[in-house]
């Protein structure tokens, strides 16, 4: 029995519903009473949802899953996963048994967009050309881990003296803090770009520092 799932991972935003597609080709005369369907977490064999003996056996996965009962007879064994969480990410296997059997695994990739970065400066007053300043770019509640890029006002990448840390919260979402240490010129713009590699979404933040003219005693 050929069981078909998408080759590419299913990408779902945190908090939204995702459909994990799975289909099979029922033979003529197929009845739902013959169908055994199991959705399982591939890596742990944890039962997610099942259908047996003509009846939906329900969700075994935090009551957040559902089948499409009206479509099962046509060979649509897809699973609806509600209110997607970071912890849902991974591989799900769809097992189908009628007279024959088959299985296939589909990957769920969870994503969450990063917030617009906030920029802070230390020190933040009495700045003069030649001073060393620390610019911090902070972006929150994204997933998966971000890629962070810095550049100056001319678009030149700044790679030295950058320290980036990413911490996951209880929901598994990441807060990103990237620190750039830079010696001030007469004035300058410093931009931080936080990229979500799955969503290909960029969040930009920038700060423009106008240095006070140097005075000599």
């Amino acid at each position: 029995l050929e069981v078909q799932v998408p080759e590419d991972p299913v990408v779902a935003l945190v908090g939204t519903d995702a459909t994990l597609c799975c289909s099979f080709s029922p033979e003529p005369g197929f009845s739902l009473a013959q169908l055994n369907l199991i959705w399982q977490l591939t890596d742990t064999k944890q039962l997610v949802h099942s259908f047996a003996e003509g009846q939906d056996q329900g969700s075994a996965y935090a009551n957040r899953t559902a089948l499409f009962p009206d479509l099962l007879a046509q060979g649509n064994a897809s699973l609806r996963l509600q209110r997607v969480r970071v912890a849902d990410e991974g591989s799900f296997t769809c097992f189908v048994s009628i007279r024959d059997f088959g299985s296939a695994a589909v990957s769920l990739q969870v994503a969450a967009p990063y917030s617009k970065p906030s920029m802070t400066l230390e020190p933040n007053k009495d700045l003069r050309p030649g001073d060393t300043v620390t610019i911090t770019c902070s972006s929150y509640r994204g997933y998966p881990e971000a890629e962070v890029f810095w550049q100056d006002g001319q678009g030149v990448p700044l790679t030295g003296n950058v320290t980036t840390s990413q911490m996951a919260n209880e929901q598994g979402l990441f807060d990103v803090h990237s620190v750039l240490r830079v010696v001030l010129g007469a004035n300058g713009t410093y931009s931080c770009l936080v990229r979500n590699p799955v969503l290909q979404q960029d969040a930009h933040g920038s700060v423009t520092i106008t240095g006070q003219p140097m005075t000599f005693p």
Epitope: L35, N36, I38, K45, T93, F95, S97, I98, F101
Partner: antibody, heavy 123, light 107 residues
């Protein structure tokens, strides 16, 4: 070819623990789930539990859950099964079994078997 | 737990005979059933998986069928090496469970 070599026979007293080992060769150890199945004299086969050597995840038969611990040493390609609070009913041959057929079935097919280890529990 | 019940518990037959062994599951298991052969003092050997698929190297005189709750294993023409104990196993739910076995003896 796949080979599973189990440790030698054990004689234990009631209340003691036993730790059996199963050395695997002939395949990539982390790619097959490893199971422990036992057979008391003249009795049916009884599944005790399994481990995914790749991620360390275990599933146990509730009947044994409080007494059995399955672990692996990936560097030694060896699986272990420890059974505690032994009683006379635990006298059996214990097999380690590797399942290369995942995910043909939702649980497991027992394809490659060790030679078995006889554990005798007697006072 | 899913209970697996085999019948008969033992059967006597002669070389060349056709033998059928039955296995019943206490609830529907689709086609997720396997059959094993075990000889005295040896580990079991997988014969059939998914109710009717022969494992590699298993002679074609072995066949099996069934789905749902009722399954059969048939040996079309018994050979001397077939005298052994046969077990069915459900592969749909944890805990994995086996039948009590059917002993095939020489008549």
């Amino acid at each position: 070819q796949v080979q599973l070599v189990e440790s030698g026979a054990e004689v234990k007293k009631p209340g003691a623990s036993v730790k059996l080992s199963c050395k695997a060769s002939g395949y990539t150890f982390s790619s097959y789930w490893m199971h422990w199945v036992r057979q008391a004299p003249g009795q049916r086969l009884e599944w005790m539990g399994e481990i995914n050597p790749g991620n360390g995840h275990t599933n146990y038969n509730e009947k044994f859950k409080s007494r059995v611990t399955i672990t692996v040493d990936k560097s030694a390609s060896t699986a272990y099964m420890e059974l505690s609070s032994l009683r006379s009913e635990d006298t059996a041959v214990y097999y380690c079994v590797a399942d290369p057929r995942r995910p043909k079935v939702p649980t497991a097919l027992f394809v490659y078997w060790g030679q078995g280890t006889l554990v005798t529990v007697s006072s | 737990d899913i209970q697996m019940t085999q019948s008969p518990s033992s059967v006597s037959a002669s070389v060349g005979d056709r033998v059928t062994i039955s296995c019943r599951a206490s609830q529907g298991i689709g086609t997720w059933l396997a059959w094993y052969q075990q000889k005295p003092g040896k580990a079991p050997r997988l014969l059939i998986y998914a109710a009717s698929s022969l494992d590699s190297g298993v002679p074609s005189r072995f066949s099996a069928s069934g789905s749902g709750t009722d399954f059969t294993l048939t040996i079309s023409s018994l050979q001397p090496e077939d005298f052994a104990t046969y077990y069915c196993q459900q592969a749909i739910n944890f805990p994995i469970t086996f039948g009590q076995g059917t002993r095939l003896e020489i008549k």
